[in-house]
Amino acid sequence: TGADTEAVVCVGTACYTAHSGKLSAAEAQNHCNQNGGNLATVKSKEEAQHVQRVLAQLLRREAALTARMSKFWIGLQREKGKCLDPSLPLKGFSWVGGGEDTPYSNWHKELRNSCISKRCVSLLLDLSQPLLPSRLPKWSEGPCGSPGSPGSNIEGFVCKFSFKGMCRPLALGGPGQVTYTTPFQTTSSSLEAVPFASAANVACGEGDKDETQSHYFLCKEKAPDVFDWGSSGPLCVSPKYGCNFNNGGCHQDCFEGGDGSFLCGCRPGFRLLDDLVTCASRNPCSSSPCRGGATCVLGPHGKNYTCRCPQGYQLDSSQLDCVDVDECQDSPCAQECVNTPGGFRCECWVGYEPGGPGEGACQDVDECALGRSPCAQGCTNTDGSFHCSCEEGYVLAGEDGTQCQDVDECVGPGGPLCDSLCFNTQGSFHCGCLPGWVLAPNGVSCTMGPVSLGPPSGPPDEEDKGEKEGSTVPRAATASPTRGPEGTPKATPTTSRPSLSSDAPITSAPLKMLAPSGSPGVWREPSIHHATAASGPQEPAGGDSSVATQNNDGTDGQK
């Protein structure tokens, strides 16, 4: 069914209408929209009370509502694909007519967590309880109903219509009937405020057709923000009643003349307006002309007023209403500025944090600070970022350049640094010599020593060598030399100073080198490609490193 019974309450600059009828939220919104409104907002406790009043009026008239709980659509909806947001007062819902989110909410229970379906909000009325201002209708969210299938829809809806202003109800000084027709097509004979552009039809008399007089008025804007009917004096006055009927229709005082005529007057501090009925305060602020949180400030001699806004807001073009100031226009922040109602907040870019001199300043985050460094070794903080470095003998590694990897000085394009054998270690290297040769004091060259078939002179003890932290490479590592059939290195005669390489084996006894002092009885063999007997020192280079070990008896040992 369509929307049937209706009730209306007008207050401030808005009218609320309540309707019964099983419509979907979309149909209800369409109904409100056809008459120039929207499903009602409930943006404050005061507005909730206005809506409650119009619902109470509807329920007094509506006998058909037999359900104990009744629901009425309001204009709070969440579109398909928009998720419930528990961090917000409106939980991700928004008002159909637009406008900013407000802190007021009155949810009935925890909301269903969903994103896919469009969700709509209704006011939940417990009809078994009296409607009290202290017990405002709760908000209930759910599916939005289906057009054309009343079974899936709720009992009714509330519309809201906003206006430039309102006229006071017409005052009758004698018997008669006023019928107001609003721009949203509602007729009523009792409105506490009548919206701009409404028509008033006044039928004077006590019902006798002969004595009935009719008057027609329109609520007009007489001056900016001043609305009236353009009538003067009380309507339907009757000498028979004088001031005794409805105070002569006067707003405050009624003064009778001896001939049954009467005049309206005002109490001290008030003045009579042009309609000769209504009294207005001599203090122009008493009518609360300022809106949106603006404060009314009296001008000199109490003649006029100006509206003043709270900090973070400014007057709009009407000079009556406050609108948010976008403080971010003035670039008050060092980096990012986020405008908020009545203020703003500063935010910092990634790599920065709030701090430093001045409001809204950002200071560099020291990623290298104790306990938070992402680098394996050296960390240098930079403005908004950082970079990692490695100690001598290591190079940066890893996808993000935070790890350090050992440089193998014994291989590479420049060739090894050592004259003869080269042993890579963590972050460094050491030289050694072939049997019959000894390491010169410079630690690089080899000189002919006493003839010996013992092991080659090896590197010093491990504990004498510096090792870098944070490396992800195994310790002191070299590869095993090429082996002959009996497990000994292949040997072929060479002339001059031999060069150890996979294709140029040397003539000597099995190559053995002393293991570090911590591992007695274990020999280490240098990698064939890591050991050279070259004619002088050469440049170090990076490379791989792996280890083979050999026992005293010539058998393979375990690493």
Partner: antibody, heavy 120, light 108 residues
Framework: QVQLVQSGAEMVKPGASVKISCKAS????????MHWVRQTPVYGLEWIGG????????AYNQNFKGRVTMTRDTSISTAYMELSRLTSDDTAVYYC?????????????WGQGTLVTVSS | EIVLTQSPSSLSASVGDRVTITCRAS???????LHWYQQKPGKAPKLLIY???NLAFGVPSRFSGSGSGTSYTFTISSLQPEDIATYYC?????????FGSGTKLEIK
Amino acid sequence: QVQLVQSGAEMVKPGASVKISCKASGYTFTDYEMHWVRQTPVYGLEWIGGIDPETGDTAYNQNFKGRVTMTRDTSISTAYMELSRLTSDDTAVYYCTNYGNLYYYAMDYWGQGTLVTVSS
Amino acid sequence: EIVLTQSPSSLSASVGDRVTITCRASSSVSSSYLHWYQQKPGKAPKLLIYSTSNLAFGVPSRFSGSGSGTSYTFTISSLQPEDIATYYCQQYSGYPLTFGSGTKLEIK
């Protein structure tokens, strides 16, 4: 506790359709949306779409529009995902998933997965 | 649709290492709608971190997340052997939901 149990592996021919089920237990079926995600070696994890069991409303990834249909049977707390006009590219593990009491589409509960192989 | 690019695509680290994975979005994503998952071979993904930095129920505190806008980071403060898995970021800012391409984490 929340459990999502999916139907078994399927071997289907190109051009055919497949319908996978996901039976929910441990909560009120209509309280949580049910979503479907598939995983292939080439495309990784792909969201196919979701259904609101309370209303039957659906949301589909445009890449699957016209080929995917999601339904539910609230009486047996089961959601279904049907994919038609299959090609070898649809060979994947298909998961049903929902976000339980968490917000913002953080998928907290997952089915065990259903392997669908499209081969002639 | 919003494309999420994860880096690195794979990484090898040692037990006890600090591991960081980055997820970059092709356009801004609300931090509430950015989540991280762990997937082990043959298993369904498991939610680790929701809304950028909140640990899912039962997830160890060595996992953490941060970021905003288009840049998000997932960190394991001290890598454990059981953390070997592929890690995915996921976002929602209007349909479709999208996932990152994944970061495969291995132990050295």
